[in-house]
């Protein structure tokens, strides 16, 4: 037990506990304290102290057990490489300061893998990947010696093992022993040596957790399973008869604290949302625990695969629920998970061996009662028949992720519980809950999901193009006529969707400039494809000067876009991506998508406009119910349409109508917004339903958007559901999976 639970509060004096060069804060209602140092410094000799039952604070002891009189903040150093095989590193030094660099070189006949140059970072870790000099002769590649570790074993034949050790006072994270397996992979995961002051940055955690999690949840064809020597990316095969259970286990003990508990709930809500965005529907189990566990959602419940319902249950959990019994019994919590996994009468149900299990544990890592929780992990492995059969070890069927939060985390404990898989990380230590919340925001942007449509990075640190990554800016330079500005939307790696009226037949490809992601450089255009039915002069004889029916065009780019945080596609109607985005069943039809996105009522939507060099979202309502007729009739107020007898001559069934003052006063589009997407935002995803075409009133004269606009100021947008055959034909090679 780290400290007595029964001791009266605040019985240790704060006299003389100060730290030179830093500050301290009390934890656990005064029963512990944490030393806090400025960035680039760490508390020496310890980061935390506990109030003993004798009324004195725990002694300041160094790693070699020497007593120190006063704590101080010391500059963070990065560890030096103890060994580097088959090469040299430079410069050599007993320690390295923050921002120092080292470079690695291999002897002749050896090739460098990993990072040739590494920089000492502010968290005491080296940037980049472990540098390894390998001659490629071994059955397995050289597993390397992560900086700060020592390796025993230098043969890499099939079934050879290597072991790793850390210097005194450092904790080994990852696998201490790794074995060369069939297919040339190493068992376990790369080790590292952690000092108590070291934390994972939110970016590191988001990247590592997500790259592992996506391997777990991104479905592949059932035929794609590989044997134990599997070196293709580890992916769980979600064949129709298989399933996935995710168990969310949340520490609600005293040591976590109420605000951290609330933060952890936020994180899990984001996680549920993230998983749903992949189009998979796992069953959830939800457990909170202190002295005893409490099961809030059982995987066996009918609604456990309904992400919205599970989120609701999670939001309703109260930290006070564990108030009276506030120890930390992680073992009991995992036993609750075991009970959900096991089957009645010990008779396995049909398909039990096709269910993948993911446990996500958030804790401060301080179990102080109930015994060692690792025994339950062993029981779970037994139950799921994992690691028993060499030919089919079934390791893919269980992933245990552990998030340790805060300064009191016991690194040994959390490392023991977490799964260890090659090239993956399952154990994380973050400084505080704010950092963990950052992680779950950053999860929205990981390379595995970059091709998912309509996803954005809604984070406080995000730029305009993080928030609107599909938005494209288009300008057409016309000699002696100035230039035309329009917007567009990235719909695939090669295509931008926009309005046809942005171009004339005389515009040459080289005079059309397209930029995405807020980048300065323009993209090269291969061709502009107009809808064949678009003809702006089509009704001139009938006294209609400009006719915008079928006002859509696709810009085909010469080079493939590289998706990233600020460049990714928007979802198009009647595609498989939109089915997944809306979390609809795979059998969903185009008509059902239409009913979901454009029901016969006022539909909340948005468009993106540029104001003072900033992209802003403008919320509007598509009038698709009883207000539709009056919205369309206001087209008569548009310049040149006042003589039109029948408004359906200009407002064809291809248009959606926004603007006006009911149900709310809608903002209007400006000239430069033309071609941009009209978007429905649903389930945290963005689906384009229209292309901005024309407006009744120019509300943006003199580059300023007027505040007061008449009630008849309406905007018209091409309804993408009405031009699907054309989109499907032109985008047939883009893997969008049109329904």
């Amino acid at each position: 037990t780290p400290w007595s639970l029964a001791r009266p509060q605040g019985s240790c004096s704060l006299e003389g506990v100060e730290i030179k060069g830093g500050s301290f804060r009390l934890l656990q209602e005064g029963q512990a304290l944490e030393y806090v140092c400025p960035s680039g410094f760490y508390p020496y000799p310890v980061q935390t102290r506990t109030c003993r039952s004798t009324g004195s604070w725990s002694t300041l002891k160094t790693q070699d057990q020497k007593t120190v009189r006063k704590a101080e903040c010391r500059a963070i150093h990065c560890p030096r490489p103890h060994d580097f095989e088959n090469g040299e590193y430079w410069p050599r030094s007993p320690y390295y300061n923050v921002s120092d660099e080292i470079s690695f070189h291999c002897y002749d006949g050896y090739t460098l893998r990993g990072s040739a140059n590494r920089t000492c970072q502010v968290n005491g870790r080296w940037s980049g990947q472990t540098a390894i000099c390998d001659n490629g002769a071994g059955y397995c590649s050289n597993p390397g010696i992560p900086i700060g570790t020592r390796k025993v074993g230098s043969q890499y034949r099939l079934e050879d093992s290597v072991t790793y050790h850390c210097s005194r006072g450092l904790t080994l994270r990852g696998s201490q022993r790794r074995t060369c397996q069939e297919g040339g992979s190493w068992s376990g995961t790369e080790p590292s040596c952690q000092d108590s002051f070291m934390y994972d940055t939110p970016q590191e955690v988001a990247e590592a957790f997500l790259s592992s999690l996506t391997e777990t949840i991104e479905g592949v064809d059932a035929e794609d399973g590989h044997g134990p020597g599997e070196q293709q990316k580890r992916k769980i095969v979600l064949d129709p008869s298989g399933s996935m259970n995710i168990y969310l286990v949340l520490d609600g003990s005293d040591s976590i604290g109420a605000s951290n508990f609330t933060g952890a709930k936020k994180c899990l809500v984001n996680l549920i949302e993230k998983v749903a965005s992949y189009g998979v529907k796992p069953r959830y189990g939800l457990v909170t625990y202190a002295t005893y566990p409490k099961i809030w959602v059982k995987v066996s419940e009918a609604d456990s695969s309904n992400a919205d319902w599970v989120t609701k249950q999670l939001n309703e959990i109260n930290y006070e629920d564990h108030k009276l019994k506030s120890g930390t019994n992680t073992k009991k919590a995992l036993q609750a998970v075991y009970s959900m996994m096991s089957w009645p009468d010990d008779v396995p149900p049909e398909g039990w061996n096709r269910t993948r299990h993911v446990i996500i544990l958030m804790t401060d890592g301080l179990h102080n009662m109930g015994g060692d929780p690792i025994t339950v992990i062993d029981e779970i492995r037994d139950l799921l028949y994992i690691g028993k059969d060499r030919k089919n070890p079934r390791e893919d069927y269980l992933d245990v992720y552990v998030f340790g939060v805060g300064p009191l985390v016991n690194q040994v404990n959390i490392n023991a519980l977490a799964s260890k898989k090659d090239n993956e990380q399952h154990v994380f230590k973050v400084k505080d809950m704010e950092n963990l919340e950052d992680v779950f925001y950053q999860m929205i942007d990981e390379s595995q999901s970059l091709s998912l449509c309509g996803m954005v990075w809604e984070h406080r640190k995000g730029t305009d193009y993080h928030k609107q990554p599909w938005q494209a800016k288009i300008s057409v330079i016309r000699p002696s006529k100035g230039h035309e500005s329009c917007m567009g939307a990235v719909v695939s790696e090669y295509f931008v969707l926009t309005a046809a009226h942005c171009f004339t037949v005389d515009d040459k490809e080289h005079s059309i400039k397209v930029s995405v992601g807020g980048e300065k450089r323009d993209l090269e255009i291969e061709v502009v494809l107009f809808h064949p039915n678009y003809n702006i002069n089509g009704k001139k004889e009938a006294g209609i000067p400009e006719f915008y029916d079928y006002d859509v065009a696709l810009i085909k780019l010469k080079n493939k876009l590289k998706y990233g945080q600020t460049i990714r596609p928007i979802c198009l109607p009647c595609t498989e991506g939109t089915t997944r985005a809306l979390r609809l069943p795979p059998t969903t039809t185009c008509q059902q998508q239409k009913e979901e996105l454009l029901p016969a009522q006022d539909i909340k939507a948005l468009f993106v406009s540029e104001e003072e060099k900033k992209l802003t979202r403008k919320e509007v309502y598509i009038k698709n119910g009883d207000k539709k007729g009056s919205c369309e009739r206001d087209a008569q107020y548009a310049p040149g349409y006042d003589k039109v007898k029948d408004i359906s001559e200009v407002v064809t069934p291809r248009f959606l109508c926004t603007g006006g003052v009911s149900p709310y006063a809608d903002p209007n589009t400006c000239r430069g917004d033309s071609g941009g997407p009209l978007i429905v935002h649903k389930r945290s995803r963005f689906i384009q339903v229209g292309v901005i075409s024309w407006g009744v009133v120019d509300v943006c004269k003199n580059q300023k958007r007027q505040k007061q606009v008449p009630a008849h100021a309406r905007d018209f947008h091409i309804n993408l559901f009405q031009v699907l055959p054309w989109l499907k034909e032109k985008l047939q090679d883009e893997d969008l999976g049109f329904l």
Epitope: G136, G138, Y139, L158, G183, G184, S185, H226, G229, Q232
Partner: antibody
Framework: EVQLVQSGAEVKKPGASVKVSCKAS????????MTWVRQAPGQGLEWMGW????????KYAQKFQGRVTMTRDTSISTAYMELSRLRSDDTAVYYC?????????????WGQGTLVTVSS | DIVMTQSPDSLAVSLGERATINCKSS????????????LAWYQQKPGQPPKLLIY???TRESGVPDRFSGSGSGTDFTLTISSLQAEDVAVYYC?????????FGQGTKLEIK
């Protein structure tokens, strides 16, 4: 020079056992796995398993599990392969082979082979 | 088990001509992390043990003439003898070591036309 010298040909009755030896010279015997491969008359090659002479650890192909035993005597740098409950389809040339220090999977050195005939 | 299938079963080529032997594995033997194919080629002359020619699908064993080359990746591999010599008459085997048990192809007999 690396040499692997195998014992002479054997004729056995069905149900009997045979023990083939492979004496290594010209290198450090315990540093390299010894692998056994067989070849039935006019047929292809078949991997049987290996022994790590350093630890005595073995790995057998599933097909031979329970019938094959690989052992070694480090004092005389010799590896042995014993196959029990012989059947007529065990008639084959049995080879010992040695891989590289770094990778036992590439059989760079071979014994001359031992013909085992199983016949009633 | 991974099944290795060679084609053709036998091949007759004139001296000085190119000989090509194919080998197909029932599943990929490429490790996508280290980009290596766990495949080797052996040559066996009558009455002799096999001899290692190529490993990692394309690395020539030392002492093997450079007229022998290996290529391919994943599931499809080729052994090429650029200019056939009389001493190349033999049976050639491919072998995978990606998964246990290690398995050989059935062999391709190369003769002179």
């Amino acid at each position: 020079e690396v040499q692997l010298v195998q014992s002479g040909a054997e004729v056995k009755k069905p149900g009997a056992s045979v023990k083939v030896s492979c004496k290594a010279s010209g290198y450090s015997f315990t540093d390299y796995y010894m692998t056994w491969v067989r070849q039935a008359p006019g047929q292809g090659l078949e991997w049987m398993g290996w022994i790590n002479p350093n630890s005595g650890g073995t790995k057998y192909a599933q097909k031979f599990q329970g019938r094959v035993t690989m052992t070694r005597d480090t004092s005389i740098s010799t590896a042995y392969m014993e196959l029990s409950r012989l059947r007529s389809d065990d008639t084959a040339v049995y080879y010992c082979a040695r891989g590289y220090y770094a990778n036992s999977a590439w059989f760079a050195y071979w014994g001359q082979g031992t013909l085992v005939t199983v016949s009633s | 088990d991974i099944v290795m299938t060679q084609s053709p079963d036998s091949l007759a080529v004139s001296l000085g001509e190119r000989a090509t032997i194919n080998c197909k594995s029932s599943q990929s033997v490429l490790n996508s992390r280290n980009k290596k194919n766990y495949l080797a080629w052996y040559q066996q002359k009558p009455g002799q043990p096999p001899k290692l020619l190529i490993y990692w699908a394309s690395t020539r064993e030392s002492g093997v003439p450079d007229r022998f080359s290996g290529s391919g990746s994943g599931t499809d591999f080729t052994l090429t003898i650029s200019s056939l010599q009389a001493e190349d008459v033999a049976v050639y085997y491919c072998k995978q070591v990606y998964n246990l048990p290690w398995t050989f192809g059935q062999g391709t007999k190369l003769e002179i036309k």
